[in-house]
């Protein structure tokens, strides 16, 4: 038997993926566990194997279909269960009735690239991945730039309150190495959260021309 507190958190990426994390104090080390998804109004059901991500937490991704297919809507309720093997039987460790569009977390933005770089500014673009057509252009972004000698946590957040998949960073220092990250969030959903940060994009500003400032 398993004692201790259990937490089971899942997010829908708005298309065809539900990602779940299950954490359990006093957890089972060598037990096989899985997440089972059972929608109330769809003909499919899906399972994924929970894999350890730390001492007492496991994660898995329920792949519901092709990455850009719209597999769920606002009226769907998906019963999500954590099942762990106990001998020849499966034991239910956690259960929730999951409303996908109340628990959104989009995929991190992808394809970051430097469009144009100068001595004091840099134009960067990105793309969003697997976001539902329901949102249309109504998304918001946060971006941050890592300066030399600072940490990501110290970086000020830049907020873009519309679906703008580019940014022009200003007042940069010439001939300096920077890193840039962006994340995205839809407007919908009581428990919706920001996407993970994108992979950092490294860039270097141009050196100042001798005798003048560009």
């Amino acid at each position: 038997a398993v004692n201790g507190t259990s937490q089971f958190t899942c997010f829908y990426n708005s298309r065809a993926n539900i990602s779940c994390v299950w954490s359990q104090d006093g957890a089972l080390q060598d037990t096989s566990c899985q997440v089972h998804a059972w929608p109330d109004r769809r003909r499919w059901n899906q399972t994924c194997e929970l894999l350890p991500v730390s001492q007492a937490s496991w994660a898995c991704n329920l792949i519901l279909g092709a990455p850009d297919s719209q597999k769920l809507t606002t009226v769907d309720i998906v019963t999500l269960r954590v099942l762990c093997r106990e001998g020849v039987r499966w034991r239910v460790m956690a259960i929730q009735d999951f409303k996908p569009f109340e628990n959104l977390r989009l995929m991190a933005p992808i394809s970051l690239q430097v469009v144009h770089v100068e001595t004091h500014r840099c134009n960067i673009s990105w793309e969003i991945s697997q976001a539902s057509h329901y949102f249309e252009r109504h998304l918001e972004f946060e971006a941050r730039t890592l300066s030399p000698g600072h940490t990501w946590e110290e970086a000020p957040l830049l907020t873009l309150k519309q679906k703008q998949e580019w940014i022009c960073l200003e007042t940069l220092t010439p001939d300096t190495q920077y890193e840039f990250q962006v994340r995205v969030k839809p407007l919908q959903g009581e428990f919706t959260t920001w996407s993970p940060w994108s992979q950092p994009l490294a860039f270097r500003t141009k050196p100042a021309a001798l005798g003048k400032d560009t």
Partner: nanobody
Framework: EVQLVESGGTLVQTGGSLRLSCVVS????????MGWYRQVPGKQRELVAD???????KYGDSVKGRFTIVRDSVKNTVYLQMSSLNPEDTGVYYC?????????????WGQGTQVTVTS
């Protein structure tokens, strides 16, 4: 402004058939679900049938096998084909649409259409 307009409600005899229609019109929206609910005096509004994107229909227990919901996403219209009607099907039938407008989802209701089944 979004509008839902129902039509087709009338007086019909037990065992008869009826088709209700509901059309959604107005400013720019995307619908992800459309359906029908009914209300009889003194009772809660109850689900008759709805259909979400992906073609998944859901029916109330009392109408399964007798009623069929059809959704035309291009015309933003939903139909309810009712057959083998009985007096218990009497009530006001309301159309409901789940609409995405400017990145947020809300439910919208029609004014209702009266269906009366006589024995």
């Amino acid at each position: 402004e979004v509008q839902l307009v129902e039509s087709g409600g009338t007086l019909v005899q037990t065992g008869g058939s009826l088709r209700l229609s509901c059309v959604v019109s107005g400013s720019h929206f995307i619908s992800d679900v459309m359906g029908w609910y009914r209300q009889v005096p003194g009772k809660q509004r109850e689900l008759v049938a709805d259909m979400a994107d992906g073609g998944s229909a859901k029916y109330g227990d009392s109408v399964k096998g007798r009623f069929t919901i059809v959704r035309d996403s291009v015309k933003n219209t939903v139909y309810l084909q009712m057959s083998s009607l009985n007096p218990e099907d009497t009530g006001v039938y309301y159309c409901k649409a789940g609409l995405w407008i400017k990145g947020r989802h809300s439910d919208y209701w029609g004014q209702g259409t009266q269906v009366t089944v006589t024995s």
